[in-house]
Interface confidence: low
């Protein structure tokens, strides 16, 4: 009778992660008596995958009933394949021996490659906000994919970005890979509603790329512009001075009125007007009883935005000679207006 041959018909098999891999093996004879075993890798460090004679291998099932005497099919199926299962698998016939079974003949091997999808891209922005015209960095990470070939693109509001650097690790062979990319984005005043998108294309995604997004609203701080003006009043002895705080983001804002350098009132912005670009406007005003002042008054609108250093704008309120003559003992009054144009005061 011809000497037993171990036939592994497929040189390679490619399987998607999570699926089962069938590794085919057939013998040409039942002689010599002894078990077959499947190993991953060759040499002294090879890993036992399945042992016909004994063992408990939860992920491995035999394609045929190996206990049948006339069975020559020793193919196995490995369930729930992960990238860690990649490698070359050998079907090996052993001759029954003492004290150990003796290797008789090995198949040529079947290389199992695993196609693993990249994880959903995670995009993260800068730890601190930056102002328009500054450049901020966004990172995009995805892990666990195989094979190594992968494409990553960055977009801002649908427009592809070019200023980015991408690394795929590790550089050498591995069961799975990770990608890390950093994009540099120049902020503009209109970026409150903007998004950056990291798009990953991989063979496992069948043309449907994965996307991760980040909102520039988390990265941008648009400082307010201040304008202090005096509004006309019917009453001769009252002045209405407004502070228009415009185009700021994010919301957090505290406004302090000062009269000749002395704090008159502090307010926290609450009811804001949102602009189309996502920035906010707010108006505060001060009613000044001009009879209470003998001299001209410098009114300062001081704004602290998003924990930053305060910015201010001043306005010189002139007191007429007539008011100076009649105002020596009239008490000073600063009050909120009863109605609130443009959202009013808080």
């Amino acid at each position: 009778e011809d000497e037993l041959q171990v036939i592994q018909p497929e040189k390679s098999v490619s399987v998607a992660a999570g699926e089962s891999a069938t590794l085919r093996c057939a013998m040409t004879s039942l002689i010599p008596v002894g078990p077959i075993m499947w190993f991953r890798g060759a040499g002294a460090g090879r890993e036992l995958i399945y042992n016909q004679k004994e063992g408990h291998f939860p992920r491995v099932t035999t394609v045929s009933e190996l206990t049948k005497r006339n069975n020559l099919d020793f193919s196995i199926s490995i369930s729930n394949i992960t990238p860690a299962d990649a490698g070359t698998y050998y079907c090996v016939k052993f001759r029954k021996g003492s004290p150990d079974d003796v290797e008789f003949k090995s198949g040529a091997g079947t290389e199992l490659s695993v196609r693993a999808k990249p994880s959903a891209p995670v995009v993260s922005g800068p730890a601190v906000r930056a102002t328009p015209e500054h450049t901020v960095s966004f990172t995009c990470e995805s892990h666990g994919f195989s094979p190594r070939d992968i494409t990553l693109k960055w977009f801002k509001n649908g427009n592809e970005l070019s200023d980015f650097q991408t690394n795929v690790d590790p550089a050498g062979d591995s069961v799975s890979y990770s990608i890390h990319s950093t994009a540099r984005v120049v902020l503009t005043r209109g970026d409150v509603h903007s998004q950056v998108i990291c798009e990953i294309a991989h063979i496992t995604l069948q043309g449907d790329p994965l996307r991760g997004t980040a909102n520039l609203s988390e990265a941008i701080r648009v400082p307010p512009t201040l304008e202090v003006t005096q509004q006309p009043m019917r009453a001769e002895n009252q002045a209405n001075v407004t502070c228009q705080v415009s185009n700021f983001y994010p919301r957090g804002l505290q406004l302090t009125w000062l009269e000749n350098g002395n704090v008159s009132r502090t307010e926290t912005a609450s009811t804001l007007i949102e602009n189309k670009d996502g920035t906010y406007n707010w108006m505060s005003w001060l009613l000044v009883n001009t009879c209470a002042h003998r001299d001209d008054v410098v009114l300062t609108c001081q704004v602290e935005h998003d924990g930053q250093q305060a910015v201010s704008k001043s306005y010189a309120l002139e007191i007429s000679a007539h008011q100076k003559e009649h105002g020596s003992d009239i008490t000073h009054e600063a009050a909120l207006a009863p109605t609130a144009p443009l959202g009013g005061s808080g």
């Epitope: 036992l48 042992n51 004679k53 004994e54 063992g55 408990h56 939860p58 206990t67």
Partner: antibody, heavy 118, light 107 residues
């Protein structure tokens, strides 16, 4: 020498908790499937729980949701966290090593006694 | 769960006797069957795995056979140290289950 030494047993009231430990020596615990088996006084053996080399865990029906098996590779130790203990959990608890490829039990610890009583 | 049934529950024998204990599984367990010996106040000792393979250090007077659902443990020539309780166990699938035990006593 390959050895398993259990500890942590004792007297606990019903509803209480206990954590059993099993210190392995002479082999790397993480390379083997590990088990807990118990034996009530005068009764037979009952398999309780197992943890595979990949960290997969298994439990007998009566302890599911109450017991948690775990291992700490750095300490080469196996643990069994037992919560909501009942009188029926009173037994000697053995730590057992499974065979490299077939998971047949080969090495047993000396056991630790757990008594659940008010 | 797979039920394991041992017979007999107890057995009296003399030194030098050959004894056989049987174990039946409620379903096919291939050859994933183990035998253990336990003496009073001691931890069990592993004797046999995969129905017929002896653990290291176990004397050859112990032998196991069977596959599928029916298995036997044979002790060829009883010695005083062999009087103990013997358990079979299936380990083909979780939860692993033991037989109720066979107590081997001196006649």
């Amino acid at each position: 020498e390959v050895q398993l030494v259990e500890s942590g047993g004792g007297l606990v009231q019903p509803g209480g908790s206990l954590r059993l430990s099993c210190a392995a020596s002479g082999f790397t615990l993480s390379s083997y499937d590990m088990h807990w088996v118990r034996q009530a006084t005068g009764k037979g053996l009952e398999w309780v729980s197992a943890i595979g080399t990949a960290g997969d865990t298994y439990y007998t029906g009566s302890v599911k949701g109450r017991f948690t098996i775990s291992r700490e590779n750095a300490k080469n130790s196996l643990y069994l966290q037992m919560n909501s203990l009942r009188a029926g959990d009173t037994a000697v608890y053995y730590c057992v090593r499974g065979g490299v490829w077939d998971d047949a039990f080969d090495i047993w610890g000396q056991g630790t006694m757990v008594t659940v009583s008010s | 769960d797979i039920q394991m049934t041992q017979s007999p529950s107890s057995l009296s024998a003399s030194v030098g006797d050959r004894v056989t204990i049987t174990c039946r599984a409620s379903q096919d367990i291939n050859n994933y069957l183990a035998w253990f010996q336990q003496k009073p106040g001691k931890a069990p000792k592993s004797l046999i795995y995969t129905a017929s393979s002896l653990h290291s250090g176990v004397p050859s007077k112990f032998s196991g056979s069977g596959s599928g659902t029916d298995f036997t443990l044979t002790i060829s020539s009883l010695q005083p140290e062999d009087f103990a309780t013997y358990y079979c166990q299936q380990y083909v699938s979780y939860p692993y289950t033991f037989g109720q035990g066979t107590k081997l006593e001196i006649k």
